[in-house]
Amino acid sequence: FGISGKHFITVTTFTSAGNIGEDGTLSCTFEPDIKLNGIVIQWLKEGIKGLVHEFKEGKDDLSQQHEMFRGRTAVFADQVVVGNASLRLKNVQLTDAGTYTCYIHTSKGKGNANLEYKTGAFSMPEINVDYNASSESLRCEAPRWFPQPTVAWASQVDQGANFSEVSNTSFELNSENVTMKVVSVLYNVTINNTYSCMIENDIAKATGDIKVTDSEVKRRSQLELLNSG
């Protein structure tokens, strides 16, 4: 390694969020080094003895891996030489939340960076016209959220209006007793208007839009993670 111990390399991480029960990615990049065998990647988690993951000499080394991560982690091995040290995490759990350190040692030097990993549940909302209701109403449903989000309605025509008096929101615990199904109904809607259902917690914000006219119904949904770094 020669002078590697005397030089610092730039390591960059991004605060990210994991959707429980799905794959997650802990993002980390570093100054590339074409000598794959000289690259060591170590992922650590605050409060955990042992490693989250280690990759060295071109392959994974799980000899010091903590049991809670056994069989749940992998680096993108073919992207390590171009400076990608991101970690793939299987079946994200609430307990995976915390502060992680991405530590890199290459022939050019060494460096590290921390990232805050948040875990929860978030999903796209779907808005439909509720024809069962006595008056025309809209039903906004999203299958998985945690922690409990806030739900707000907005309308293109009545901008700034408060719809809390004419809407009803419920949170139904899903079968695994962690995440919840969000259902919100907006009453007394008018046609030729666009309505938005906004669901938000400290991890994600999702919006569902619906445009109702005499001839058609148009829908659109989007989801954004509320990253702080």
């Epitope: 029960g21 994974d60 080394d61 069989g71 995440t179």
Partner: antibody
């Protein structure tokens, strides 16, 4: 391409043990978990357990703890499963399979051809 | 331990038709469900993983969907070579679990 070659069929006596092998080729043996499954006619598949040859780490289905022992030999890229105290209930086809995703335990993406074990006196 | 209840156990369908098989997990939730095709004398073949991701080389006639505890697998435009046993695998937890299998016959 990824290949898993399993040892041949065996006829064994009740109460004895049998050790079957699964030789891997076409990928880095130490970097992927290898899983084992049991198939009996009319019973579908049952998960036995898996092993990470890179460190010898194992996971077992509680039902097969004490019955199955999983090992791996890095030098020959071969995984082994020993079954002990055999009874007629152990008569089945046993499959080994590579778990996709490297150190991440994924789905069973490449399978061996199976080893048929018949337990009979 | 998680159990995967697969249904139906057998079905018969016409050439060119469509079939759907379901697997229900006894508990938990995650997207780690795979679907396999198994023909007599052959080793099982992975068709779909992570609920809906098609393996390379598998035709788009095969599809998967689901969330929570309920997962489904469909084959459309059925062909004679689709006659086989199909089964699901839950691989999200430490202990993996198989569905009981569905034997498909093409008429």
């Amino acid at each position: 391409q990824v290949q898993l070659q399993q040892s041949g069929a065996e006829l064994v006596r009740p109460g004895t043990s049998v050790k079957m092998s699964c030789k891997a080729s076409g990928y880095t043996f130490t970097s992927y978990w290898i899983g084992w499954a049991k198939q009996r006619p009319g019973h579908g598949f049952e998960w036995i357990g898996d092993i990470y040859p890179g460190g010898g780490y194992t996971n077992y289905n509680e039902k097969f703890k004490g019955k199955a022992t999983l090992t791996a030999d890095k030098s020959s890229s071969t995984a082994y499963m020993q079954f002990s105290s055999l009874t007629s209930e152990d008569s089945a086809i046993y499959y080994c399979a590579r778990l996709d995703g490297s150190s991440y335990r994924g789905a069973m993406d490449s399978w061996g051809q199976g080893t048929s074990i018949t337990v009979s006196s | 331990d998680i159990q995967m209840t697969q249904s139906p156990s057998s079905l018969s369908a016409s050439l060119g038709g469509k079939v759907t098989i379901t697997c229900k997990a006894s508990q938990g939730f995650n997207k780690y469900v795979a679907w396999y095709q198994h023909k007599p004398g052959q080793c099982p073949r992975l068709l779909i993983h992570y609920t809906s991701t098609l393996q390379p080389g598998i035709p788009a006639r095969f599809s998967g969907s689901g969330s929570g505890r309920d997962y489904s697998f469909s084959i459309s435009n059925l062909e004679p070579e689709d006659s086989a046993t199909y089964f699901c695998l839950q691989y999200g937890n430490l202990l993996y679990a198989f569905g009981g299998g569905t034997k498909l016959e093409i008429k």
